[in-house]
């Protein structure tokens, strides 16, 4: 850069800003206060993001992609604040933004590298495919590509299939694990390194229960303390698998402390719920109640799946009638 008479050029300052898809962010820029303030924000040194001079915005030649999405902190410009408020960032907004600020005595440039991450809450699903059982960890929209790890009984396992579909702005990822015939516990972790956000799914198989017709069964479901934070919103769902698909018996929302019950023979103990114990009772069992029962406790940071297998056998009376 050439030295200029009566003019001070203050070269580049560089910062990294990490934004989340569809959220608002601030691209920071400050300068030494002075008169005749001119502010230009440019993207990749080509596209006009925002211009301010003569005491007001001049957005006539603003690139259309930034229309109605940018503003300055107008009351703070005289104090040396040239930061840009940027609404609803998308993955296409990633890149280098340069803020050029001029006053009567100096010019400064600040570079801001914007990185945008996506992490829609993942899910852990339990599926039957013919005679096989699968656990599937999936995330519908994530960017950049996440790190997915599986553990069996707290030991990392190398088998890690990833089914990935990429769209214009993010990845959709499924990681299935065949757990046929296993009664181990499994854990899947999905990590977005950019957003420093981790989600964990945990699956536990309980010992099978044998019950007689007309009896009741009590099925336990208690969160693992490592993951569970009662202050965080979560949802508990009990469902029963019949012919390969799950039907919901009941669910509980922590935010409203609402319990919705779809099966009249199902009961939940309110006092236990207050102690974060989501065990349930199913009364007056009949033969068609045999099957797999799944308790799903989910929040933004984890999914805890507990599965019980219940075998309902005919009572002696019923057997002797046949």
């Amino acid at each position: 850069i050439f030295p200029l008479a009566f003019f001070i050029y203050v070269p580049m300052n560089e910062q990294i800003v990490i934004g989340r898809l569809d959220e608002d962010i601030i691209l920071p820029s400050s300068f030494e206060r002075g008169s005749e303030v001119v502010i230009h924000w440019k993207y990749q040194d080509s596209y006009k993001v925002h211009s301010y001079y003569k005491g007001s915005d001049h957005l006539e030649s603003q690139d259309p992609r930034y229309a109605n999405r940018t503003s300055l902190f107008y009351n703070e410009i005289q104090n040396g604040n040239a930061s840009l408020f940027f609404r609803r960032v998308s993955l296409l907004d990633e890149g280098i933004y340069t803020c050029y600020v001029g006053t009567a005595i100096q010019v400064i440039t600040n570079k801001v590298v914007l990185k945008v991450g996506v992490f829609l809450t993942p899910v852990m699903k339990y599926e039957k495919r013919n005679t096989n059982s699968f656990l599937i960890c999936s995330v519908l929209s994530v960017y950049p590509r996440p790190i997915i790890t599986w553990k069996m009984d707290n030991t990392p396992i190398s088998e890690n299939n990833m089914e990935e579909t990429g769209s214009l702005d993010s990845f959709s990822i499924n990681s299935p694990l065949n757990i046929t015939g296993s009664n181990s516990s499994y854990e899947c972790t999905i990590e977005n390194s950019l957003l420093k956000q981790t989600w964990t799914g945990r699956w536990t198989m309980k010992d099978g229960l044998h019950k007689m017709q007309s009896e009741h069964v009590s099925l336990s479901c208690q969160p693992v303390n490592d993951y569970f934070s009662p202050n965080q919103d979560f949802k508990v769902t009990w469902s029963r698998m019949k012919s390969g698909t799950f039907s919901v018996l009941a669910y509980y929302l922590s935010s409203s402390q609402n319990t919705i019950i779809n099966e009249s023979r199902f009961s939940w103990n309110k006092e236990l719920i207050n102690q974060s114990d989501f065990s349930m009772n199913l009364m007056d069992l009949n033969l068609s109640d045999s099957g797999e029962y799944l308790c799903n406790i989910s929040s933004d940071e984890y999914t805890l799946l507990t599965i019980h297998t219940v075998h309902v056998e005919p009572s002696q009376e019923t057997a002797s009638h046949n």
């Epitope: 850069i1 003019f7 230009h40 006009k48 003569k54 001049h58 030649s61 050029y100 001029g102 010019v107």
Partner: nanobody, 125 residues
């Protein structure tokens, strides 16, 4: 959009003079700071001079200071670059460019808002 047009380039002997013009038909150049840049074959673009819009402050690169003069004629809606004592190393394509008010983008290296297509200056020895 602002359409800038350079003119006045040509072939000149060492020590000679040329006056380059930068015009913008249908647009008021007084609202803009105008900067001059040049690019020689195989070299990076170099900023050489700029004049602000509000106060007509002028800036020069060391390589041309004392030899080149930038000025503005509001009546003719034109900015001039008077080049004296030309040297072979001044051979390049010369561009004018515009930005609002101050020579902010110019001083930072040239992310100017509007550019002309350039005029060739050749200085022979």
């Amino acid at each position: 959009d602002v359409q800038l047009q350079e003119s006045g380039g040509g072939l000149v002997q060492t020590g000679g003079s040329l006056r380059l013009s930068c015009a913008a038909p249908g647009f008021t150049l007084d609202d803009y700071a105008i900067g001059w840049f040049r690019q020689a074959p195989g070299k990076e673009r170099e900023r050489i001079s700029c004049i602000t819009s509000s106060t007509n402050r002028t800036y020069y690169a060391n390589s041309v200071k004392g030899r080149f003069t930038i000025s503005r004629d509001s009546a003719k809606n034109t900015v001039y670059l008077q080049m004296n004592s030309l040297k072979p190393e001044d051979t390049a394509v010369y561009y004018c460019a515009a930005e609002p008010i101050l020579c902010v983008l110019w001083s930072a290296g040239g992310a100017m808002d509007y550019w002309g297509k350039g005029t060739q200056v050749t200085v022979s020895s």
